[in-house]
């Protein structure tokens, strides 16, 4: 029960985190015009990963995309890449984790497979969260560095060189959304990894002992005493219980390290 709860909660937390990473990546307010100690301008500038915007006091807002790829700073490209990698990994992790959820039954998927899938999705969430945190932190560092370089004729926007007194930029809302979302995805991933340990069946060196009686092929299972005869209509081998113990024929056909008494 605790394992299911941990896995479910990890999934939900990761889902919220990845939604946040997507939102942060799409947001325009990665950096916003610093209004402190500045003359009061009637325009407000803010920039995202994909475009820069200007909001006039009248309410008119104009956004321009960064249509150049080569003309953009390498750091911005790196941040874009980190965020996209984070989203892709997170999305794949979500897809994997849906099938790994203990509360969802898909065919005859074994717990061992679910455990492996839970671990895989957990690792993907952790890497996704780290990518988002790294991307946001790199951008924040870039802002802090540029903040003090408020000399005229310096590179001021994401789009190129302009002959003007530099507008100083500070942290935008997207940075905080990204940090929180990355953290949530990371926590969700850790929870999935913890849940994986509970899902994986315990390993043991014991095998089910088979006693062959003349006439009937009977597999004695301690704790189960459910036998399958070799005659009559009951010719198919039946599972004794879900814990991994199998009838003799099954064990012979499909050996598994998870068989235990």
């Amino acid at each position: 029960m605790a394992v299911t709860a941990c896995q479910g909660l990890g999934f939900v937390v990761s889902l919220i985190g990845i939604a946040g990473i997507i939102a942060a990546t799409c947001m325009d307010q990665w950096s916003t015009q610093d209004l402190y100690n500045n003359p009061v301008t009637a325009v407000f500038n803010y920039q995202g990963l994909w475009r820069s915007c200007v909001r006039e006091s009248s309410g008119f807002t104009e956004c321009r995309g960064y249509f150049t790829l080569l003309g953009l700073p390498a750091m911005l490209q790196a941040v874009r890449a980190l965020m996209i990698v984070g989203i892709v990994l997170g999305a794949i992790g979500l897809l994997v984790s849906i099938f790994a959820l203990k509360c969802i039954r898909i065919g005859s998927m074994e717990d061992s497979a679910k455990a492996n899938m839970t671990l895989t999705s957990g690792i993907m969430f952790i890497v996704s969260g780290l990518c988002a945190i790294a991307g946001v932190s790199v951008f924040a560092n870039m802002l802090v560095t540029n903040f003090w370089m408020s000399t005229a004729n310096m590179y001021t926007g994401m789009g190129g060189m302009v002959q003007t007194v530099q507008t100083r930029y500070t942290f935008g809302a997207a940075l905080f959304v990204g940090w929180v979302a990355g953290g949530l995805t990371l926590i969700g991933g850790v929870m999935m990894c913890i849940a994986c340990r509970g899902l994986a069946p315990e390993e043991t060196n014991y095998k089910a002992v088979s006693y062959h009686a003349s006439g009937h092929s009977v597999a004695y299972k301690p704790g189960g005493f459910k036998a399958s005869t070799g005659f009559g209509s009951n010719t198919k081998n039946k599972k004794i219980y879900d814990g991994g113990a199998r009838t003799e024929d099954e064990v012979q056909s499909y050996p598994s390290k998870h068989d235990y008494v």
Epitope: P39, V40, T41, A42, S52, S58, T164, V165, T167
Partner: antibody, heavy 118, light 113 residues
Framework: QVQLKESGPGLVAPSQSLSITCTVS????????VSWVRQPPGKGLEWLGV???????IYHSALKSRLSISRDNSKRQVFLKVNSLQIDDTATYYC????????????WGQGTSVIVSS | DIMMTQSPSSLTVTTGEKVTLTCKSS????????????LTWYQQKPGHPPKLLIY???TRESGVPVRFTGSGSGTDFTLTISSVQAEDLTVYYC?????????FGSGTKLEMR
């Protein structure tokens, strides 16, 4: 069509307060800003302040302590109040609609003449 | 506050002549975010309120004759009338609309020679 009309007292005694009303039509006060500009006789234009569509008000720094701009959206009216009037506050007072682009004042009222005299 | 300096204060012209009015600001009116200059030009005839001619330093307001052209960037701006007509002989003002307060220039008066 867009129209703005100022109405004021005409003559005001020094140290008194001046209240001017700008009644607008053809546009919404919650969508567009309204600026106040004055022009002393034979002189240039002086920007006094603005009330933006979102209700935010900005005043000329030199007159900030004496100015107040407010509005009544339902009555479609914008109000300018100037306290502690002096002789050099004598001017024609205009209200003007702020355009959507570039903070340009695209429509103006005809203005109301205010004389500060004892 | 930003100081707006217009020159000359008055200018004597003849109809059909090309006229250039200048306006200088004490600070740059260029916004780096959209590379637009926040400067407007107005025309005011005697006994009338000002009329908007140009915004964003070079964008002509609808209904304004094409003979009026705004140009310039940063701190130096010009209003050019390619062929002055009799009705153009009046006062022209430039205005900073970038940094509060929105200060006006002192004006340039066009007079008939």
């Amino acid at each position: 069509q867009v129209q703005l009309k100022e109405s004021g007292p005409g003559l005001v005694a020094p140290s008194q307060s001046l209240s001017i009303t700008c009644t607008v039509s053809g546009f919404s006060l919650t969508s567009y800003g309204v600026s106040w500009v004055r022009q002393p006789p034979g002189k240039g234009l002086e920007w006094l302040g603005v009330i933006w569509g979102d209700g935010n008000t900005i005043y000329h720094s030199a007159l900030k302590s004496r100015l107040s701009i407010s509005r009544d959206n339902s009555k479609r009216q914008v109000f300018l109040k100037v306290n502690s009037l002096q002789i050099d506050d004598t001017a024609t007072y205009y209200c003007a609609k702020q355009g959507l682009y570039g903070h340009a004042m695209d429509y103006w009222g005809q203005g109301t003449s205010v004389i500060v005299s004892s | 506050d930003i100081m707006m300096t217009q020159s000359p204060s008055s200018l004597t012209v003849t109809t059909g002549e090309k006229v250039t009015l200048t306006c200088k600001s004490s600070q740059s009116l260029l916004n780096s975010g959209n590379l637009k200059n926040y400067l407007t030009w107005y025309q005011q005839k005697p006994g009338h309120p000002p009329k908007l001619l140009i915004y964003w330093a070079s964008t002509r307001e609808s209904g304004v004759p094409v003979r009026f052209t705004g140009s310039g960037s940063g701190t130096d701006f010009t209003l050019t009338i390619s062929s002055v007509q009799a009705e153009d002989l009046t006062v022209y003002y430039c205005q900073n609309v970038y940094i509060y307060p929105f200060t006006f220039g002192s004006g340039t008066k066009l007079e008939m020679r």
